[in-house]
Amino acid sequence: TGGQGPMPRVKYHAGDGHRALSFFQQKGLRDFDTLLLSDDGNTLYVGAREAVLALNIQNPGIPRLKNMIPWPASERKKTECAFKKKSNETQCFNFIRVLVSYNATHLYACGTFAFSPACTFIELQDSLLLPILIDKVMDGKGQSPFDPVHKHTAVLVDGMLYSGTMNNFLGSEPILMRTLGSQPVLKTDIFLRWLHADASFVAAIPSTQVVYFFFEETASEFDFFEELYISRVAQVCKNDVGGEKLLQKKWTTFLKAQLLCAQPGQLPFNIIRHAVLLPADSPSVSRIYAVFTSQWQVGGTRSSAVCAFSLTDIERVFKGKYKELNKETSRWTTYRGSEVSPRPGSCSMGPSSDKALTFMKDHFLMDEHVVGTPLLVKSGVEYTRLAVESARGLDGSSHVVMYLGTSTGSLHKAVVPQDSSAYLVEEIQLSPDSEPVRNLQLAPAQGAVFAGFSGGIWRVPRANCSVYESCVDCVLARDPHCAWDPESRLCSLLSGSTKPWKQDMERGNPEWVCTRGPMARSPRRQSPPQLIKEVLTVPNSILELPCPHLSALASYHWSHGRAKISEASATVYNGSLLLLPQDGVGGLYQCVATENGYSYPVVSYWVDSQDQPLALDPELAGVPRERVQVPLTRVGGGASMAAQRSYWPH
């Protein structure tokens, strides 16, 4: 993978027709930031600027607008927002920040409401949104941020909303809060300094007994020469009811620990950007996948990492030792005193004593950190969001597939082989303006990922199998969603009955998978061409033989007959071979790719001259042929002839 990290095998530029994509936009609407999939998977609810939308995503192609309800910030709040020196152009609007399914008939939504957070229930009727009634709009402080640029997170668990956001206009008072439902409203205590003033929340993930919050904040427990940011996981118990005298209406089970995502001997990736849970059959083996960047730009470029954390490891750290603050030295050290009962954060049902609560107020930071497994480290890219799913290969093996949104508007599809580093199947540039990916939502039933941007929503089918036109290319792609169907001779999406199909997720080796009959027993190091393109030379013209670079992971060379053309003697320009008609120029030219130890012809040309036709090599007798015209340039100037066929670069 080199110092850059894995390269995407295939790259699609914005507007490249070879990657099936569709884009939803709506005149006058912007900031498609919040995405929610309906329980049946057929409707995508979208929180945009001053509106909530319901999109029908049942059919392939552009999502269809079912209906849209406006929810603008009121004139009163817009006026106040402008008075408070905020921008009427960019800030004094209602940016929808929370959108959750409350029950079968209602969504719950919150927005910034021109720096005056507000929430409301939205009634559903046959998955259509009913208009918002102004007398049903409630205070949303602690549920939505004031400022649209502030990070936030929220998750609905058992009818209660757990949210992490900024709780004041200035953006200096972070809060973790539980609202809705029958349990008492609970908050973190600002005065106890459980959270640093700059805490920035990126995810909330429920587990069996607790809810985990993922965030970054300035570290207080290290002596460092510059302000050091640190990533954290915090837990609160679902059954927490707050204290009776001490910690009234406050969490009594709040604990936090450091998350570590680093390669051995390297500076850590210390800024968490997003995290998701990939559930497993057994909760103990479930893992959390998180995207990190670093506050240090190595070599002047941003880099990103994806780390996996096991729930078991997180639980173990929260059951371990605490740190405590030495008031004299203002240093955090390991607490070595006696245990209190019930132990803070243990989710025991009984009422906690004043002694236990007093202890809890000061012992909320865990001594150990949760160490993640780095699965993907990539420089020159800043990942902003991720979505993760498990895909079953042809052999029944399970593969983790990650979809990673970047700060420049592209989507990376990464595959994590079992107990190994990730590789990148493809990179798709979605935004022509390099706008960042705001959100990602997997829609498994639709086989697609939806990516929210400032200007609209991209629907990205999870795989693009049909672009791999040969068995070799299909197998080398190592996309768990794709396999080669020898019958139809197509690379297709895996479906139910795929017995004779070809795929090699483990090695990605076409040598064993794609050869049939006697060749299977004695594999050849290079496969024969599938098609020969016949080209006629034109006197006094330079022929240009294009070679489409189908894979960024392959190395390419040209051969003439059975001999490799040396780099020194050939004129290769942008991958194309340039030929001057002269004696001995005719015959078979092949652009050969070598990838994963396997060589295969990407394109084969038979060059013939009008005055001296050549007999085709008998070994190639069975290979289909096609007469083509290639670009040519007259020697001594003149126009270049247009090719009949265009060759697309990846």
């Epitope: 006026t79 409401f113 709009v137 206009f169």
Partner: antibody, heavy 121, light 109 residues
């Protein structure tokens, strides 16, 4: 129930300052703006200004800028108005009034009983 | 500065419907003026009745309603009662400040 308690009267010298209080109870103080209104004997009501109790942002009637300063103390759920450089023109009853108008409109529902300020040497 | 004008006095009988109005010197009153109606009873007892043109304050009897009639804001008391005898002030919002009217003295005879 909601109550806004104001001291009954203040007697102050011309040129001096006075700081009057408005203690709120029966609701979450920081959820509502607080308005201040002046009533001179035999005259109508004049709006002085208002304060957003959650972030101490203030909005003043141009006429009272420099004269009135609005503040809050969240811990005691109390709003304050300080009047400076007092003259006989400032002799009046001063009311605090809660704004219950939520997100969509302004509305003053609960009023204090007023503080009568007399400026006299 | 805008001037807000109200009837100086009105008289009604118990059970009758009476409408008090509020005019702005700058033109028609609109919902953006968030018309407020406040009742003053003896001993400086002020109570907010209506906010934002037509929103009744919590605990205010349903006989009080606010609206826009023509180019003015209006307070209507449907079935006036003797305890409604008071001075009623209207206040209008002008994008960054409030202006109160002079008040209407309502007598219920």
């Amino acid at each position: 129930q909601v109550q806004l308690q104001q001291p009954g009267a203040e007697l102050v010298m011309p040129g001096a300052s006075v700081k009057m209080s408005c203690k709120a109870s029966g609701y979450t103080f920081t959820d509502y703006w607080m308005h201040w209104v002046k009533q001179r004997p035999g005259q109508g009501l004049e709006w002085i200004g208002a304060i957003d109790t959650s972030d101490s942002y203030t909005s003043y009637n141009q006429k009272f800028k420099g004269k009135a300063t609005l503040t809050v103390d969240e811990s005691s759920s109390t709003a304050y108005m300080q009047l400076s450089s007092l003259t006989s023109e400032d002799s009046a009853v001063y009311y605090c009034a809660r704004d219950y108008g939520n997100f969509y409109y302004y509305a003053m529902d609960y009023w204090g009983q007023g503080t009568s300020v007399t400026v006299s040497s | 500065q805008a001037v807000v004008t109200q009837e100086s006095a009105l008289t009604t009988s118990p059970g009758e419907t009476v409408t008090l109005t509020c005019r702005s010197s700058t033109g028609a009153v609109t919902t953006s003026n968030y018309a407020n109606w406040v009742q003053e009873k003896p001993d400086h007892l002020f109570t907010g009745l209506i906010g934002g043109t037509n929103n009744r304050a919590p605990g205010v009897p349903a006989r009080f309603s606010g609206s826009l009639i023509g180019d003015k804001a209006a307070l209507t008391i449907t079935g006036a009662q003797t305890e409604d005898e008071a001075i009623y002030f209207c206040a209008l919002w002008y994008s960054n400040h409030w202006v109160f009217g002079g008040g209407t003295k309502l007598t219920v005879l």
